[in-house]
Amino acid sequence: EEELQVIQPDKSVLVAAGETATLRCTATSLIPVGPIQWFRGAGPGRELIYNQKEGHFPRVTTVSDLTKRNNMDFSIRIGNITPADAGTYYCVKFRKGSPDDVEFKSGAGTELSVRAKPSAPVVSGPAARATPQHTVSFTCESHGFSPRDITLKWFKNGNELSDFQTNVDPVGESVSYSIHSTAKVVLTREDVHSQVICEVAHVTLQGDPLRGTANLSETIRVPPTLEVTQQPVRAENQVNVTCQVRKFYPQRLQLTWLENGNVSRTETASTVTENKDGTYNWMSWLLVNVSAHRDDVKLTCQVEHDGQPAVSKSHDLKVS
């Protein structure tokens, strides 16, 4: 009789995460009698994956019926593969021993590589809003992919960005990887409706990249421009003064009228009109009783926008 050999025909097997891995192994003889065991890794720290005789291994099924006479096929299937299952698997024949079985012969090993899809990219912007002409940073993160090779691109409104830095971790061998990228974006007044997109391409995605988006509306603050104008006298001794608050974003705005430095009225922007670019316009008016004033009146429209320091515009009202 020729001595038993353990044959693992596949040097490597590539499986997608969530699927089933088939690890093939055959023996060339029934003798010596004893169990086949599967291990991940070699040496004293190896991990037992399956023992034909002892223990329960719910994720593992055998390809053939091991109880069939003359069975020499000890191939196994491992279900619901995750990146953590990657490694080299050895089919090892043991000789029945008393009290313990004795390792007899090992197969050459099969390297299991797991293809895992990256998680949906998550794009996050700065904690505080910034105004046009400022440069802001956006980060994009995606995790759990394998193999390591991955491509990340940034876009703003469909235009590819070039000012970004990307890292894939860890640098060395790992069961799965993460990508982290930071892009720099210069804001413009027209960016309320703009989007920043992070696009991740990986072999597991079959040419259909994953995208994460951030709306610049959550990042930008467009400060208002103010214009105070005096309208013709509406009624006897009454002058209508308007304050046009234009092109601001976001909507959160409080306006205060001052007469000669004294607060006359405070109101919060409510019925605003929206511009095509996503900014808002609002108008406030003040009816001034001229007869109540002997001297010229300095009217000030003071606007506090989105919690920022107030901006103001004044108008001198002539009392003739």
Partner: antibody, heavy 121, light 111 residues
Framework: EVKLEESGGGLMQPGGSMKLSCVAS????????MNWVRQSPEKGLEWVAE??????????HYAESVKGRFTISRDDSKSSVYLQMNNLRAEDTGIYYC????????????WGQGTTLTVSS | DIVLTQSPASLAVSLGQRATISCRAS??????????MYWYQQKPGQPPKLLIY???NLESGVPARFSGSGSGTDFTLNIHPVEEEDAATYYC?????????FGGGTKLEIK
């Protein structure tokens, strides 16, 4: 350490019923076929019955002499195998051994100490 | 059923000599190049103990003075050199097909 311990033997009258039990320890019971073999001075060693694994749908096989009268069963959660014997005859007398089949081929590597059944009026 | 005939029914062998026990099957117990024959030793008050599996392979923990040979229908158990503790009854058993059957036994006495 592998152990097989039979119980349930005794003296029975012909036509009676008896159930033998065997509790296993020291190995993963559910991974092994189990057998009953009996021994008497008249017939020597005689294989009686076999029960296979859950994956074999607990298939059972019997010697012709006990077919229809004996039933082998197992409870993997209790690591136990049983032999229900009905319509007992004098020729069923003997020592009944509970046996582990190591390699699914009547490879009887571990035997219990046996339990004695006597069928006599 | 396959009938196994053992011979001799008993034998006496001097310490250190060779004991040879024969087992003949009424039909071949060989398939796919393997011989489904087993040998057991039984001492009084004890269950049988497996010595040889698949005709010629020594069960773990069994001394190397026990050996098995044969194929098809003719099989032999050899014990050499015989020791005092080998006094027992020896049985052959097949698993060529169902039902499994045993030989009638050979009683070995040590002189």
């Amino acid at each position: 350490e592998v152990k097989l311990e039979e119980s349930g033997g005794g003296l029975m009258q012909p036509g009676g019923s008896m159930k033998l039990s065997c509790v296993a320890s020291g190995f993963t019971f559910s991974n092994y076929w189990m057998n009953w073999v009996r021994q008497s001075p008249e017939k020597g060693l005689e294989w009686v019955a076999e029960i296979r694994l859950k994956s074999n749908n607990y298939a059972t096989h019997y010697a012709e002499s006990v077919k229809g009268r004996f039933t082998i069963s197992r409870d993997d959660s209790k690591s136990s195998v049983y032999l229900q014997m009905n319509n007992l005859r004098a020729e069923d007398t003997g020592i009944y051994y509970c046996i582990r089949d190591y390699d699914y081929d009547a490879y009887f590597d571990y035997w219990g100490q046996g339990t004695t059944l006597t069928v006599s009026s | 059923d396959i009938v196994l005939t053992q011979s001799p029914a008993s034998l006496a062998v001097s310490l250190g000599q060779r004991a040879t026990i024969s087992c003949r099957a009424s039909k071949s117990v060989s398939t796919s190049g393997y011989n489904y024959m087993y040998w057991y030793q039984q001492k009084p008050g004890q269950p049988p103990k497996l010595l040889i599996y698949l005709a010629s392979n020594l069960e773990s923990g069994v001394p190397a003075r026990f050996s098995g040979s044969g194929s098809g229908t003719d099989f032999t158990l050899n014990i050499h050199p015989v020791e005092e503790e080998d006094a027992a009854t020896y049985y052959c058993q097949h698993s060529g097909e169902l039902p499994y059957t045993f030989g009638g036994g050979t009683k070995l006495e040590i002189k």
